[in-house]
């Protein structure tokens, strides 16, 4: 499970509030860090192990997911044809 946590706020400038947000994710046994719907998530460790990246549903709804050659990452293709590539180190 993941929740968005506001780490700090800049109250020195009253006209605008700057909030730094991060995800706090507590993964269950057998899960490790991943990406689901373009957000941090906990995913089945075997997905990471086997590099079946699209199984963790990393793309936004309506986008198509494809594995890169050698399973080095994935691409998310928007309906309009724009492609976003993510590589895993």
């Amino acid at each position: 499970t993941c929740e968005i946590v506001t780490l700090d706020r800049d109250s020195s400038q009253p006209r605008r509030t700057i909030a730094r947000q991060t995800a706090r994710c507590a993964c269950r046994k057998g899960q490790i860090a991943g990406t689901t719907r373009n957000k941090p998530s906990c995913v089945d460790a075997r997905i990471i192990k086997t590099k079946q990246w699209c199984d963790m549903l990393p793309c936004l709804e309506g986008e198509g997911c494809d594995l890169l050659i050698n399973r080095s990452g994935w691409t998310c293709t928007q309906p309009g044809g724009r492609i976003k590539t993510t590589t895993v180190s």
Epitope: A23, R24, A26, K29, G30, Q31, I32, A33, R46
Partner: antibody, heavy 129, light 104 residues
Framework: AVTLDESGGGLQTPGGALSLVCKAS????????MFWVRQTPGKGLEYVAE????????NYGSAVKGRATISRDNGQSTVRLQLNNLRAEDTGTYFC??????????????????????WGHGTEVIVSS | ALTQPSSVSANPGETVKITCSGG???YGWFQQKSPGSALVTVI????ERPSDIPSRFSGALSGSTNTLTITGVQADDEAVYFC???????????FGAGTTLTVL
């Protein structure tokens, strides 16, 4: 190189308590789940306890549940096992172990027994009167 | 509980296979030369091999059974090999009773 160094073993009295410490070095300690595993004369290897990379989660083997407390200090790169109400069956060699998965910042991750990639040399505990 | 054979034997140069079944998630294999002495991981996360472990050691997962293979066994490989994983419910770690490898 990854090193895990256990200390705190020795002769203990039944009904007493012990505190074992594992000092880690050579890796980003706060990113890894950690384990205590013991080897008792009649039982082979036995899962004792584990703790998540950030210390928020703990789990215990059935033989020590209710008597053991595992904790960690990520600033000092140490993991501690406290075991109370000692019994003769607690006699054995206690090993500290690391789970290989490096949990990224912002995540709390459990280790996995099948992902243990490094062990300490072990510290011997004898419970006897 | 995990199931692994209590003992196997082989001549130098032969291939040895040790199976372990009954767990969940991933499997590891841990070598111990004598009781109470240091444990050495030879395989972790099903098939990963630490950099200092010879390539003759390999692991493979099929269903819920993991097989440790030692190709071209050597006298120095004589030891007890424990498998480790999570119990079937995924609530705690569990180890096999150990397989004693004797090199004839």
């Amino acid at each position: 190189a990854v090193t895990l160094d256990e200390s705190g073993g020795g002769l203990q009295t039944p009904g007493g308590a012990l505190s074992l410490v594992c000092k880690a070095s050579g890796f980003t300690f706060s990113s890894h789940g950690m384990f205590w595993v013991r080897q008792t004369p009649g039982k082979g290897l036995e899962y004792v306890a584990e703790i998540t990379n950030d210390g928020s989660g703990t789990n215990y083997g059935s033989a020590v549940k209710g008597r053991a407390t595992i904790s960690r200090d990520n600033g000092q790169s140490t993991v501690r096992l406290q075991l109370n109400n000692l019994r003769a069956e607690d006699t054995g060699t206690y090993f500290c172990a690391r789970s290989t998965y490096e949990c990224p910042g912002g995540f709390s991750c459990w280790g996995d027994t099948g992902q243990i990639d490094a062990w300490g040399h072990g510290t011997e505990v004898i419970v006897s009167s | 509980a995990l199931t692994q054979p209590s003992s196997v034997s082989a001549n130098p140069g032969e291939t040895v296979k040790i199976t372990c079944s009954g767990g969940s998630y991933s499997y590891g294999w841990f070598q111990q030369k004598s009781p109470g002495s240091a444990l050495v991981t030879v395989i972790y996360w099903d098939d990963e091999r630490p950099s200092d472990i010879p390539s003759r050691f390999s692991g493979a997962l099929s269903g819920s059974t993991n097989t440790l293979t030692i190709t071209g066994v050597q006298a120095d490989d004589e030891a007890v090999y424990f498998c480790g994983t999570e119990d079937i419910s995924g609530t705690a770690g569990v180890f096999g009773a150990g397989t004693t490898l004797t090199v004839l």
